[in-house]
Amino acid sequence: EEELQVIQPDKSVSVAAGESAILHCTVTSLIPVGPIQWFRGAGPARELIYNQKEGHFPRVTTVSESTKRENMDFSISISNITPADAGTYYCVKFRKGSPDTEFKSGAGTELSVRAKPSAPVVSGPAARATPQHTVSFTCESHGFSPRDITLKWFKNGNELSDFQTNVDPVGESVSYSIHSTAKVVLTREDVHSQVICEVAHVTLQGDPLRGTANLSETIRVPPTLEVTQQPVRAENQVNVTCQVRKFYPQRLQLTWLENGNVSRTETASTVTENKDGTYNWMSWLLVNVSAHRDDVKLTCQVEHDGQPAVSKSHDLKVSAHPKEQGSNTAAENTGSNERNIY
């Protein structure tokens, strides 16, 4: 009679994570008597996957009735496959004895596991940055297999080119991770902008996964300040306004100084929002000119989002008729305020 052969017809099998894998194995003879065992890997460190007669293998079931004496089909099904199950599986015939000895092994079936990448997580810089600055965004996705993967970056639908991507580990692994860093130049119009990381993988059937970051969490648009003197509101009274424009985020504190002395401090509350997502705010100061002998230097000082204060001044001529004058410095923060100075 011809010597027993162990036949594993499939050289490789690919299974999606969570599904069951069927590993086929048949023998050509009932002799010699002895059990079949399945192993993952070869050599002394091989892992026992299934033993016909003993051992606990809750995820493994035999495809046919392996207990029947005439059975020659020792195919198994492994349930709930994960990337950790990837490897080469060997169906091995043992000859019964004391102890049982390995008689013949099949050629092996390589099991590869297709595992979806996790949803990409995009994170931006820890601190806000101002327009014209370049900031870095990172995108991470984990747990996918096979290793081949495509990652793209977009800003408001426009593909970015300045990024660097790594897939780890470099060698063979049960699953892989991708890490990418993109550089984005901020503009004053970016409050409503989004940065998108898009990951495409064979397991996603052409429907890529996306992770997003809102630039509103990254950008700081400093305000522009303008101090103006309004026409006389009543005899000897002048209305001075400080217009705080195009700032983001809203967190802003404004202080009026009269000849360098603090006159009033307020926090921006009822702001108006511009189409680009930035804010405007205005603060008023009512000045009683008759209470002053000399010219008055009025300063609108703004602290925006915890940054160093910026200011703009206006010289109020007491001797002559009130006229609009101003001198620039810079600005940040918001509030609406009315104040009489006597």
């Epitope: 892992e47 026992l48 016909q52 007669k53 003993e54 606990h56 293998f57 207990t67 004391s98 102890p99």
Partner: antibody, heavy 114, light 108 residues
């Protein structure tokens, strides 16, 4: 439902023999080895041996060679453990265990006493 | 034969405490063939961990197993009152199969 039902309490005189039984239900007894384990009061577990009910082939721990004999009757789905030349050292609880190791009988208490 | 030595033989732990039981083999045991059982007084042993690190059905996730070669361990991340029991390691890597002497774990 898988069950291993063992015979009841045995009280036997020194020098005699006893045959303990373990009846399997819920599975084909030929599909698995059947193991026997000894546990003396408040002590550890000792592996006695295992039998392949399909062909009667068995393996014993050296300590139990000559003391224990395992047999199986596939028609009644029952495994047996015979213990001979009993002494007080054989007083213990004896468990049968299915080869997959998660199913144990409830144990048979054997007392050897004159 | 492979002798399995468990330590400590007896120990007590407070609720919430991390507990590690060890099982040392006199010669190498393949990790596929190293199992752990839990036994409470008056009951048959229950399969607790199989193939070194896999939890049997119904075993709480605070339990874990690890090891290779001649050194294996069972760890409870946070001891609970219901974990008080005896734990036995078991090898079926080579005949004769053997159990460790057991560790009796008590709750303080």
């Amino acid at each position: 439902e898988v069950q291993l039902q063992q015979s009841g309490v045995e009280v036997v005189q020194p020098g005699a023999s006893v045959k303990l039984s373990c009846t399997a239900s819920g599975f084909n007894i030929e599909a698995y080895y059947m193991h026997w384990v000894k546990q003396r009061t408040e002590q550890g577990l000792e592996w006695i041996g295992r039998i392949d009910p399909e062909d009667g082939e068995s393996k014993y721990a050296p300590k139990f060679q000559g003391k224990a004999t395992m047999t199986a009757d596939t028609s009644s789905s029952t495994a047996y453990l015979q213990l001979s030349s009993l002494t007080s050292d054989d007083t213990a609880v004896y468990y049968c265990v299915r080869g997959s190791y998660e199913y144990w009988g409830q144990g048979t208490t054997l007392t050897v006493s004159s | 034969q492979i002798v399995l030595t468990q330590s400590p033989a007896i120990m007590s732990a407070s609720p919430g405490e991390k507990v590690t039981l060890t099982c040392s083999a006199s010669s190498s045991v393949s990790s596929s063939y190293l199992y752990w059982y839990q036994q409470k007084p008056g009951s048959s042993p229950k399969l607790w961990i199989y193939s070194t690190s896999n939890l049997a059905s119904g075993v709480p996730p605070r339990f874990s197993g690890s090891g290779s070669g001649t050194s294996y361990s069972l760890t409870i991340s946070s001891m609970q009152a219901e974990d008080a029991a005896s734990y036995f390691c078991y090898q079926w890597s080579s005949y004769p199969y053997t159990f460790g002497g057991g560790t009796k774990l008590e709750i303080k």
